[in-house]
């Protein structure tokens, strides 16, 4: 099981995405969640959003499955600046996964950057124009 973080932009919207890769039989009791500014106590209860993994992917001819939690910010503001983390927890086995911290930095010019993702996922956004700069 592993967890990755990513981001994508659609117009003025910013999507923060937590992706968990797991085997079919590992899904039961697993919760994926996204926290903001929670360095030590990130939990489903303190999260911005949580997703309970499907106990059944719907088909049987699958090995590893990817499940995605998507948190959408319709318009990034200074309030969204901070440190984010994707996490996952199994209520069945007690396994806990913690993704890398990543940050949203809102600049005085009205733009924002997302840092701390994989190199190819280091994003800089022009907030006003809604484009990748």
């Amino acid at each position: 099981i592993n967890i990755t973080s990513s981001a994508s932009q659609e117009g003025t919207r910013l999507n923060l995405i937590c992706t968990v890769w797991h085997k079919k039989e590992e899904a039961e009791g697993f919760v994926v969640f996204l926290c903001k500014d929670r360095s030590g106590d990130c939990s489903p209860e303190t999260s911005l959003k949580q997703l309970r993994l499907k106990r059944d992917p719907g088909i049987d001819g699958v090995g590893e499955i990817s499940s995605q939690l998507m948190f959408t910010i319709s318009q990034v503001t200074p309030l969204h600046s901070g440190t984010y983390q994707c996490c996952a927890r199994s209520q069945k086995s007690g396994i806990r996964l913690q993704g890398h911290f990543f940050s949203i930095l809102f600049t005085e010019t009205g733009n924002y950057t997302v840092t701390g993702l994989k190199q190819r996922q280091h994003l800089e956004f022009s907030h006003n124009e809604g484009t990748l700069s």
Partner: antibody, heavy 116, light 107 residues
């Protein structure tokens, strides 16, 4: 005991839309895929699509994209199929079924008749 | 989409005969194949799951075998209540698909 109770027979005009229901009881509705299957008189079974009530994820066979819309209401443990722009070929029995590997529990079916 | 071909389309038998119904997949589906029986004006009923696994409440005269692309449903000593339509179904990949069916009728 597990039951899937479907809504009663429907007569609809061509071009209209209908919404059929399937109320589940006796199990945790949100953690099993609900399937919808079409059967025309004297014909075989045709898989329309499925919905996972826990998160609303739905899948369709290509033929029914744009024709069928699957939804689920967690509060009432009810799955729905909406069929739009009805034509005579939509006349059939529509079944809901729960997936546990195979489709282990089936509703009694709803007969839809499209006629002017 | 995976196509399931059932044969024969119709099978005429006498009660107490033993029969085999075939289902062939257009590509390998491992053991992700299920069998259903449907009587006229009734809902289908699951007989066998995952090619060979029995279902609680289904008589032991029903058995399934096969893997990959070729599957068989066997009925050991057919009873009158067994007549009707038999369908196979694959759950290996989206979209789920059904075979065209085999009609088991009284000779």
């Amino acid at each position: 005991q597990i039951q899937l109770q479907q809504s009663g027979a429907v007569l609809a005009r061509p071009g209209a839309s209908v919404k059929l229901s399937c109320k589940a009881s006796g199990y945790t509705f949100t953690t099993y895929w609900m399937q919808w299957v079409k059967q025309r008189p004297g014909q075989g079974l045709e898989w329309i699509g499925a919905i996972y009530p826990g998160d609303g994820d739905s899948r369709y066979t290509q033929k029914f994209k744009g024709k069928a819309t699957l939804t689920a209401d967690k509060s009432s443990s009810t799955a729905y199929i909406q069929l739009s722009n009805l034509v005579s070929e939509d006349s059939a029995v529509y079944y809901c079924a729960r997936r546990l590997g195979g489709f282990d529990y089936w509703g009694q079916g709803t007969t839809l008749t499209v006629s002017s | 989409d995976i196509v399931l071909t059932q044969s024969p389309p119709t099978l005429s038998v006498t009660p107490r005969d033993s029969v085999s119904l075939s289902c062939r997949a257009s590509q390998s589906i491992s053991n992700n194949l299920h069998w259903y029986h449907q009587k006229s004006h009734e809902s289908p009923r699951l007989l066998i799951k995952y090619a060979s696994q029995s279902i609680s409440g289904i008589p032991s005269r029903f058995s399934g075998s096969g893997s990959g692309t070729d599957f068989t449903l066997s009925i050991n000593s057919v009873e009158t209540e067994d007549f009707g339509m038999y369908f196979c179904h694959q759950s290996n990949s989206w979209p789920h698909t059904f075979g065209g069916g085999t009609k088991l009728e009284i000779k």
